[in-house]
Amino acid sequence: IPPHVQKSVNNDMMVTDNNGAVKFPQLCKFCDVRFSTCDNQKSCLSNCSITSICEKPQEVCVAVWRKNDENITLETVCHDPKLPYHDFILEDAASPKCIMKEKKKPGETFFMCSCSSDECNDNIIFSEEYNTSNPD
């Protein structure tokens, strides 16, 4: 940590890596919830034109795909993996790619992924082959 940069009172954003260097936040697509045409594809682009610097260095990129009788939506945000999102733990937060996993939600089809490389929630991957055969 640079000596002239104060440690914060609430320590909210003074996150450091193992070497004590300040951890910088990553970039994520951040369009919140938008209608989507992504359906029955192995992967989709988010079509989100907004890339934001995540508010906190520990945050990762998240994408949530939901389909019900009326529409399909795709949500793109930054989120702290220590906290649940839509009541689910972000199990794959360390992944460099956003690999969609289905979650049980009544009345809809619900997939979610998280990842920790810049703008990684721009490309969301549904492919089962990718999940099982690709070591990344």
Partner: nanobody, 122 residues
Framework: EVQLLESGGGLVQPGGSLRLSCAAS???????QMWWVRQAPGKGLEFVS?????????YYANSVKGRFTISRDNSKNTLYLQMNSLRAEDTAVYYC???????????????WGQGTLVTVSS
């Protein structure tokens, strides 16, 4: 020796504008990823804006998007932050910083300036 020297801070009324500068030396400025980071009194760091090189792609925190503009002049080795529609919550010490990958995946060297104080108050 890497040096980053910020200037342009001061007292400004809400709704006003300021332009911060960061003069860089001791490294090849035009090839580096540069950031503006701020720290409000008693608070943590907030990462305001980033500009990449090459290409000059720019990124912003949601809190400043549409109000702040980051830019660079590689011929002058200078980074800028144009701040418009300033609010009381923008009051902070503003630092410029640079990041360079160490060559080990996911790790970086970072360098910081000494900061310049921006106070937004009527």
């Amino acid at each position: 020796e890497v040096q980053l020297l910020e200037s342009g801070g001061g007292l400004v009324q809400p709704g006003g504008s300021l332009r911060l500068s960061c003069a860089a030396s001791g490294f090849t400025f035009g090839t580096e990823q540069m950031w503006w980071v701020r720290q409000a009194p008693g608070k943590g760091l907030e990462f305001v804006s980033r500009i990449d090189s090459p290409g000059g792609r720019t990124y912003y925190a949601n809190s400043v998007k549409g109000r702040f503009t980051i830019s660079r002049d590689n011929s002058k080795n200078t980074l800028y932050l144009q701040m418009n529609s300033l609010r009381a919550e923008d009051t902070a010490v503003y630092y410029c910083a640079k990041r360079r990958p160490t060559g080990v995946s996911g790790t970086f060297y970072d360098y910081w300036g000494q900061g310049t104080l921006v106070t937004v108050s009527s």
